[in-house]
Interface confidence: medium
């Protein structure tokens, strides 16, 4: 299953499969997740060790049992790969590290005014993997405002040094934020030249392309098909790079296929997994386990559940079958790809889906619609559960926010549907940041079912909660993921670090905002809230948030959107934006539906609708 726990002041002993330098434990964990054999990692921050060579050391580890002995090491951080963790799997890393210089090959230097601009330049440069920026207070005047774009053979820094007034970070290409754009074309009977950075065996060009996309130095590839003239080169996928970033030449060649990495695609990247099953094909590799199962799909599921399994072959040979069950060979290799691919067999083969991020991990005015006042712009993927509920009558407009809680479920406020109960007038946009990006061609979800709380009454503030079942399930991406739900009876007063997001008004008599806004707001006790709203009953099924002095709040157009809090290391949906007296007025906190109080209702409705819980439980 998915293991998310981090172990502070602990170091896993033994099991090393790779080591590198990373700026923090989270980046180390990401590298472990994407390494074919890494199950565990240990990270040594600068403060944890005097040995300069081991500072910022990230040690990737494997273990046949799935665990290793932990030894005490002050400052060290250890944890698990996020393989099998569904929507938590991502190669995107947005953090900027102050006082740190990430070393590598400096291939481009320019003057910029901010670290954000430097990161943008790196993201928009095909070869840039990470960068360093010297601030205006850097000790050497001639280097101030320098933006150094860098790469390295492994995609991680060759060294990391503590250095005042320097800020470093990674390209946001894995966040699907590159402005470069990508070539989706696959070129039949064409071979690319230039430098080979790696060689793996794949069953087709599409697997080859996905491997290229997630390889730190692959910009394009050439795949030799299973009928290529040289037998030893059949099914070989050559991952390639060049100085210019594009192939310097291409040669017409029968039974070859070439194409480009999709890392520079904007808004959408392929999943880092391969779901296709290949009939009549055997994948060779190190034997992990053999089990009797009924059908190739169960074999793939078995491989996916066994965390070390990378690929499998399901044999239909008579001697490998008993009644309806046949042998499922679970296999692995050093690089995650088969060591041999054989055609014309009585088997079917495929890959583990442990890196797929679509899995459901069960281990996130005066009482009128309430936008964010006093907030700031959000960035892509920052609040991936936020959706925009829009109504298309003669014109189309944003009316409310909502929160994605499962592949097919959105949680919002009941009052959003006051006077607009018809399912077919609603359009739900997920994975967006700017409302202005929505065109007639932008995909949207339609509503299959609106489930309004049975005790909600129009123009009353109680039970302001509704579930939307979407007509079709959504895939999880970097910009579209569910928020975890709280536990029933959670006490909101113990939450800290809470945020409200939405496209609503930025002042009481304002207008809908283009860019998704965010604001950090403290929770207020119900007793305090009741004092501020003496004409209304603040119930235990509500939660309030706001500053005594006002100035920051939700407002018209934010209704139905999320109030999320980072709690005991995880983001959770604490409230649904509901109502308030004006917006951001002094001593008039915003009032939110308290999600924890409705957990029974949410589970009952999401389960009874299709027999199985579809919402995101904490993971």
């Amino acid at each position: 299953g998915c293991l998310t726990q981090l172990y502070e002041n602990a170091f896993f002993r033994g099991g090393d499969v790779a080591s590198m330098y990373t700026p923090n434990a989270q980046y180390c964990q990401m590298r472990c997740t994407f390494h074919p054999r890494c199950l565990l990692f240990s990270f040594l921050p600068a403060s944890s060790i005097n040995d300069m060579e081991k500072r910022f050391g990230c040690f990737l580890k494997d273990s046949v049992t799935g665990t290793l002995p932990k030894v005490h090491r002050t400052g060290a951080v250890s944890g698990h790969s996020l393989k099998q963790c569904g929507h938590q799997i991502s190669a995107c890393h947005r953090d900027i590290y102050k006082g740190v210089d990430m070393r590598g090959v400096n291939f481009n230097v320019s003057k910029v005014s901010s670290v954000e601009e430097c990161q943008k330049r790196c993201t928009s440069n095909i070869r840039c993997q990470f960068f360093s920026y010297a601030t205006q207070t850097f000790h050497k005047a001639e280097y101030r405002n320098n933006c150094l774009l860098k790469y390295s053979p492994g995609g991680t820094p060759t060294a990391i040094k503590v250095l005042s007034n320097v800020e470093s970070g990674f390209s946001l290409k894995p966040c699907a934020l590159s402005e470069i754009g990508c070539h989706m074309n696959i070129f039949q009977h064409l071979a690319f030249s230039d430098v080979d950075v790696a060689r793996v065996l794949t069953p087709d060009a599409f697997v080859c392309r996905t491997i290229c996309t997630y390889h730190p130095n692959c910009l394009f590839f050439t795949f030799y098909t299973n009928v290529w003239k040289i037998e030893s080169q059949r099914n070989v996928c050559l991952l390639k790079t060049s100085e210019s970033g594009t192939p310097s030449s291409s040669t017409p060649q029968e039974n070859t296929i070439s194409g480009y990495s999709l890392l520079t695609c904007k808004r959408t990247l392929p999943e880092p997994c391969h779901s296709k099953i290949y009939p009549g094909v055997d994948f060779g590799g190190e034997e992990l386990n053999v089990t009797f199962v009924k059908g190739v799909n169960v074999c793939q599921e078995t491989c996916t559940k066994m965390i070390r399994c990378q690929f499998f072959t399901y044999s239909l040979l008579p001697e490998d079958c008993k009644e309806e069950k046949c042998k499922c060979f679970l296999r692995l290799s050093m690089d995650g790809s088969p060591t041999r691919i054989a055609y014309g067999t009585q088997g079917s083969s495929g890959y583990s889906l442990r890196l797929c991020n679509t899995g459901d991990n069960s281990v996130c005015t005066t009482k009128t619609s309430t936008r964010i006042v006093g907030g700031t712009n959000s960035s892509w993927g920052e609040w991936p559960w936020q959706v925009s509920l829009q109504v298309k009558l003669t014109a189309q407009r944003h009316l409310c926010g909502g929160s994605l809680i499962g592949h097919q479920w959105v949680l919002t406020a009941a009052h959003c549907f006051d006077g607009l109960p018809l399912q077919d007038v609603w359009r739900i946009y997920s994975g967006i940041l700017n409302l202005s990006d929505i065109t007639k061609d932008t995909p949207f979800s339609q509503i299959k079912e609106i489930i309004i709380h049975q005790n909600y009454k129009v123009s009353e503030g109680n039970h302001d909660i509704a579930l939307i079942k979407l007509q079709a399930p959504l895939n999880y991406t970097e910009f579209q993921k569910p928020i975890c739900l709280p536990s029933k009876g959670d006490t909101s007063t113990i939450y800290t670090n809470c945020w409200v997001t939405g496209w609503g008004f930025s002042k009481e008599k304002g207008e809908i905002q283009n860019i998704l806004q965010k604001v950090n707001i403290p929770l207020v006790t119900n007793e305090e809230c009741q004092k501020r709203y003496q004409d209304y009953k603040i119930t235990q099924r509500m939660v309030c948030a706001g500053y005594k002095e006002g100035g920051k709040d939700a407002c018209k157009g934010d209704s139905g959107g999320p109030l999320v809090c980072k709690h005991n290391g995880m983001w959770r949906l604490v409230g649904i934006t509901s109502w308030g007296e004006g917006c951001a007025r002094r001593e008039q906190p915003g009032v939110y539906t308290k999600v924890a109080e409705y957990m029974d209702w949410i589970l009952e409705k999401t389960q009874s609708s299709d027999g199985k819980a579809q919402m995101q439980s904490p993971a």
Partner: antibody, heavy 117, light 107 residues
């Protein structure tokens, strides 16, 4: 390594009050709740409640309201539980425990409180 | 409050035996269940949780299963160091509640 260091055993008279402390080491004290659990041979483990040192917010099991009060001192990274009007039923081992998500991943060594005339 | 009923209250088994402890909740707890091991004079230790499964460092002979109201902790091959009291705990609804414990001994 996350460590929770609790104060030593206490022998108290009925009607008195006691303050049990729990010092947190190895993590950011203000980011995680501190929960308190009571253990007796008869009733086993009972959840008393929790405090969030970052916000000062508290949650109590209804059964222990009026009996236990939680406080936290950010500067010393210490959480406290104050038990008042002690009776023999308050004799127990009291644990502080820190969750990851919801389950209790880290525990103090326990503080034995004995109430006896 | 949700009641957690554990059975048996104690058991005695031989080294290498398969041991099963059950925990029943008075209402659906939606997989929000943890199992703890407590040795005499020590604090409880988290073994398994409904969200992240087996804790790191916990031997793979321990496993948890179940859903709804019925849950099971299994020790596939009992070892001398497994002598302890085992508790289940629900964290679906406050107040969080524990089972009364199962004492495991070696014959």
């Amino acid at each position: 390594q996350v460590q929770l260091q609790q104060s030593g055993a206490e022998l108290m008279r009925p009607g008195a009050s006691v303050k049990v402390s729990c010092k947190a080491l190895g993590y950011t004290f203000t980011d995680y709740e501190m929960h308190w659990v009571k253990q007796t041979p008869v009733l086993g483990l009972e959840w008393i409640g929790a405090i969030h040192p970052g916000s000062g917010g508290t949650a109590y099991n209804q059964k222990f309201k009026g009996k236990a009060i939680f406080t936290a001192d950010k500067s010393s990274r210490t959480a406290y539980m104050y038990l008042s009007s002690l009776t023999s039923e308050d004799s127990a081992v009291y644990y502080c425990t820190r969750p990851y998500g919801y389950p209790f991943a880290y525990w103090g060594q326990g503080t034995l409180v004995t109430v006896s005339a | 409050d949700i009641q957690m009923t554990q059975s048996p209250s104690s058991l005695s088994a031989s080294v290498g035996d398969r041991v099963t402890i059950t925990c029943k909740a008075s209402e659906d707890i939606y997989n929000r269940l943890a199992w703890y091991q407590q040795k005499p004079g020590k604090a409880p230790k988290l073994l398994i949780s409904g969200e992240t499964g087996l804790e790191a460092g916990v031997p793979s002979r321990f496993s948890g299963s179940g859903s709804g109201t019925d849950f099971t902790l299994t020790i596939s091959s009992l070892q001398p160091e497994d002598v302890a009291t085992y508790y289940c705990q629900q964290y679906w609804s406050t107040p969080w509640t524990f089972g009364q414990g199962t004492k495991v001994e070696i014959k």
